[in-house]
Interface confidence: medium
Amino acid sequence: SAPGEDEECGRVRDFVAKLANNTHQHVFDDLRGSVSLSWVGDSTGVILVLTTFHVPLVIMTFGQSKLYRSEDYGKNFKDITDLINNTFIRTEFGMAIGPENSGKVVLTAEVSGGSRGGRIFRSSDFAKNFVQTDLPFHPLTQMMYSPQNSDYLLALSTENGLWVSKNFGGKWEEIHKAVCLAKWGSDNTIFFTTYANGSCKADLGALELWRTSDLGKSFKTIGVKIYSFGLGGRFLFASVMADKDTTRRIHVSTDQGDTWSMAQLPSVGQEQFYSILAANDDMVFMHVDEPGDTGFGTIFTSDDRGIVYSKSLDRHLYTTTGGETAFTNVTSLRGVYITSVLSEDNSIQTMITFDQGGRWTHLRKPENSECDATAKNKNECSLHIHASYSISQKLNVPMAPLSEPNAVGIVIAHGSVGDAISVMVPDVYISDDGGYSWTKMLEGPHYYTILDSGGIIVAIEHSSRPINVIKFSTDEGQCWQTYTFTRDPIYFTGLASEPGARSMNISIWGFTESFLTSQWVSYTIDFKDILERNCEEKDYTIWLAHSTDPEDYEDGCILGYKEQFLRLRKSSVCQNGRDYVVTKQPSICLCSLEDFLCDFGYYRPENDSKCVEQPELKGHDLEFCLYGREEHLTTNGYRKIPGDKCQGGVNPVREVKDLKKKCTSNFLSPEKQNSKSN
């Protein structure tokens, strides 16, 4: 029988009555244009909903918007449009919500053409009250909060001015003109690129990268001939034009741009691109596009300095700059990433790594699934996951893969089972061990979300017809119950739950459509009465992550350590609760050569775990070098993989070589790093 119909699945008793008492409908009695929803703060229950519609007139488009506020996780909403003087809010800027629990909100208003500047509405009390502020400029981007101080705001103007506010948008100061891109760094530092002559587009590759650490009082030029820049983890990256031709190279800094190193990565031409796929304080996943319109490139993983890169995955699917890739960080288990490759026959296949890009492999075929028509051998095939690339291709995939750090090991994704991704209607699959094994969870495409740190999974069928049924599981997707949340079906547009997967409330958004009426409606369901009791010690079981061979002493060792987690038993129907903290017990592993990558000037011959010196650094290899305050580079040929915590065991000792003669970089000479004051 189908999942959810077994006798043993009837564990949740009287759930219809329990859920009916906790289902709250809200009809937004005025519209059906577009709707955007933002959570304000963490565990506050405050949601802001901005509804917008445009009335097309002959000469112009007249817009109208309404603002609603809930403080009970969406069960009830109050129209607070009057707090923003019934002003039309620009949806392209969205609602700028302050970091952490600052309670700050900035809404950017639409103003008439002749006005001197834009207008914002600011709240510091979780949208209970708003202050109107007229700006001395027209904003081009949403207001950007400093991650360290939510009173500090940054914005670019339509005239490419860089504006800063130190008092949460009350007063603004233009600190620089001719700015293309600006970003907050750490410690309230601002990085930005600026053009000297024409415009951002015309000067691409000739931009300067500047830094201010005092909100615009003084500046330092930290890069020239810049194409673009990015921040990832503790790394600052700059894509820099080469002297002689139109190629560009990645340079890396770990000291906010004071010193730079040239990354040991291939240079790219005009039509190619670099992309930071993922970055943390330890390392970076970098995609380097192949020459030509191939739609793929190579993934490289960095060392702890962001300088030395190991080739991680060939033929990585990534269509164009700013295009789509399937690269997914599985946040529910350390070291796990999923992505897609474009094989020689142009089919797309999914690959997974469990060790932060060290090795990639196909996903194991789910036990309860057959190989589809793409499989040559009906007994041997793999699971292939649909991610944002599939969504961009308009396949019937309503959601990207889902994982949450506090729902340990759980990964939910649409996929197909065969030799490659299929364009047929996908099913939904779940892994409870971070991607090692998979099970078909739901037939056909669905929207899904995780509640109560994995204690409940909720799903809604993706259908063009109106729906009125929600499915939920209390055992990590093995068994499903269905609940009819409304008598009158709605056209479903989205599921909303508080970010962080700790909530037990889910909001179902959609619209009703009848001959006379088309309006937004939300149903918020609180599952608190389904999980009646708090989980106790007996409800949890010990689970060793990354375990593939229990007989092996090193079983579960990934990046030099193994972790045991306390995980909720599938049979336990109880609340993890909002304050649930993942309990894990790490233990250090012995080092092997697998825990090291080859340093600059060294490589691993195929099928060998030893690093050997490159015979000679010649030609363009000479540019792969370290430039900084130090005059020389020393190495023993091995470098510990970033984040690897192994101890003892293999300790590769090498004669230290001085490579300074082999290495030059001309990115920035210290004399160019002049300081400027306002």
Epitope: L31, R32, P56
Partner: antibody, heavy 124, light 106 residues
Framework: QVQLVQSGAEVKKPGSSVKVSCKAS????????ISWVRQAPGQGLEWMGG????????NYAQKFQGRVTITADESTSTAYMELSSLRSEDTAVYYC?????????????????WGQGTTVTVSS | DIQMTQSPSTLSASVGDRVTITCRAS??????LAWYQQKPGKAPKLLIY???SLESGVPSRFSGSGSGTEFTLTISSLQPDDFATYYC????????FGGGTKVEIK
Amino acid sequence: QVQLVQSGAEVKKPGSSVKVSCKASGGTFRNYAISWVRQAPGQGLEWMGGIIPIGGWANYAQKFQGRVTITADESTSTAYMELSSLRSEDTAVYYCARQGRKTGYYYYYGMDVWGQGTTVTVSS
Amino acid sequence: DIQMTQSPSTLSASVGDRVTITCRASQSISSWLAWYQQKPGKAPKLLIYKASSLESGVPSRFSGSGSGTEFTLTISSLQPDDFATYYCQQADGHITFGGGTKVEIK
């Protein structure tokens, strides 16, 4: 300015069907609804049903359920009303009207543009 | 279906008079009510929508009020062009019209 132009007068035998067309010109067709209203000689207005062209969503008054079919062709901006099993009491002037809907775009219920009317006579 | 009852069915008045027509719904229809004017041999013309909003191009002597179940159309100063039949129409569920009020010359 939006105009609704209806097809010409019809004389029908009892038991037969009539199909009246209503073509919109000069404005948006799809976001509104088209209502059909009839008026028997010397009587008041009677709503028969309507359609939302954008989704082909038809809606009928209880009295006419099963006897009336309302359709729309977005490509030609034309709505149609077909009434079957005609009887003498169906003799009336049939109007189409543009019906505002309670949506983000047209925020009222009111028939703001009307066709000129089509006289249908049912007689043996 | 919601029933709409209009009163009076006939009303005799003179030019310059203030005229009031009432429409009662069998259940609450919020503000989803429209008023129309119809002259013999012509299609109806929308005067008021959403109970009190004046359709563009309609003279300001026409006004609508009410919500829930009781609604009123008022002509503040009757003009020669205003002698016609007036209909109310609800649009809360299926559409229904009132029976009409004929305004004739006294």
